[in-house]
């Protein structure tokens, strides 16, 4: 039975040209995290594998930095980066947990962070 929950940074906004940290946290389970995949609309951004460490897709090498923790830092943001991002936690023995983050990249200098929310 999957008892864990994923807490994410939720709906967030950031300025064009700036950086943002995408963060997820898995709680309420003792399952072992074997790998975390970060995706944007079915495209793989990066993997953090428990044994093999961090790996960044060739699509994002110049704009993605690993961490902090199992999170991901997006740099040099463009308006095209607006959209849904997913952290996919592969765990044993529970299986897969998925968290969703919506990022809006703004032209203006006003970029407020949304509240945290949970996905069971």
């Amino acid at each position: 039975m999957m008892t864990g929950t994923i807490e994410t940074t939720g709906n967030i906004s950031a300025e064009k040209g700036g950086s943002i940290i995408l963060q997820c946290h898995l709680s309420s389970t003792t399952a072992q995290v074997t790998q975390v995949n970060w995706e944007q609309q079915d495209q793989l951004l990066a993997i953090c594998n428990a044994d093999l460490g961090w790996h960044i897709s060739p699509s994002f090498k110049d704009r993605v930095a690993p961490g902090p923790g199992l999170g991901l830092t997006l740099q040099s943001l463009t308006v095209n980066d607006t959209g849904e991002y997913f952290c996919i936690y592969h765990t044993y023995p529970d299986g897969t947990y998925t968290g969703r983050i919506f990022l809006e990249v703004l032209e203006s200098s006003v970029a407020e962070h949304g509240a945290r929310f949970q996905i069971p």
Partner: antibody, heavy 126, light 113 residues
């Protein structure tokens, strides 16, 4: 020893769809340490990477922007192979098409092409 | 896209002599996170697919003779054949696998003088 065996037609009519298959022996299409690619070669374009499919806890694809609107690369785990479909073929798509294994060594998402299929000369002509 | 430019386009070298092929990338293919250079060299003979010689810019593929070596950093790379053999007549390509689309050089044709 890894071997890649290509199959598919050598002649395609303009506007039709090219379908090629690459059968894998000595490795698994679902391997977590390999990526499966299609590349083509022509006198006018040289060697041109088209796209790839790979499994990292789930299946992913990456495609070259130049063909993204008309390409599909699919794995077939039951037959341990992967395929290329390229729609709306034109004479400019005439080339030798290769499948190739990208060995994910040190970086599980990128690597050099260490095994290649024998190549299939595809001519687009009516 | 990263453009890979090889020089020369063709090269004639005497048997037993050194052959040097250059490759320049339009941007760095060094990934600072793991300090790896995402560059490979291939040899292609007529009617055959390319064959991997060198990866990570300087690591020789298993089974490749030690007369083949790769070097370079940043954006400038070199493939060296220390003592040319008759079977080395081929076209040589560099390739970057740093970012999409993966791109190849235009090729250097190596012949015997």
């Amino acid at each position: 020893q890894v071997q890649l065996q290509q199959s598919g037609p050598g002649l395609v009519k303009p506007s039709q769809t090219l379908s090629l298959t690459c059968a894998i022996s000595g490795d698994s299409v679902s391997s977590n340490s390999a990526v499966w690619n299609w590349i083509r070669q022509s006198p006018s374009r040289g060697l041109e990477w088209l796209g790839r499919t790979y499994y990292r806890s789930k299946w992913y694809n990456d495609y070259a922007v130049s063909v993204k609107s008309r390409i599909t690369i699919n794995p077939d785990t039951s037959k341990n192979q992967f395929s290329l479909q390229l729609n709306s073929m034109t004479p400019e798509d005439t080339a030798v098409y290769y499948c190739a294994r990208e060995r994910a060594l040190y970086d599980i998402l990128a690597g050099s092409f260490d095994y290649w299929g024998q190549g299939t000369l595809v001519t687009v002509s009516s | 896209d990263i453009v890979m430019t090889q020089s020369p386009d063709s090269l004639a070298v005497s048997l037993g002599e050194r052959a040097t092929i250059n490759c320049k990338s339009s941007q760095s293919v060094l990934f600072g996170f793991n300090n790896k250079i995402y560059l490979a060299w291939y040899q292609q003979k007529p009617g055959q697919p390319p064959e991997l010689l060198i990866y990570w810019a300087s690591t020789r593929e298993s089974g490749v003779p030690d007369r083949f070596s790769g070097s370079g950093s940043g954006t400038d790379f070199t493939l060296t054949i220390s003592s040319l053999q008759a079977e080395d007549v081929a076209v040589y390509y560099c390739q970057q696998y740093y970012s999409f689309p993966y791109t190849f050089g235009q090729g250097t044709k190596l012949e015997i003088k």
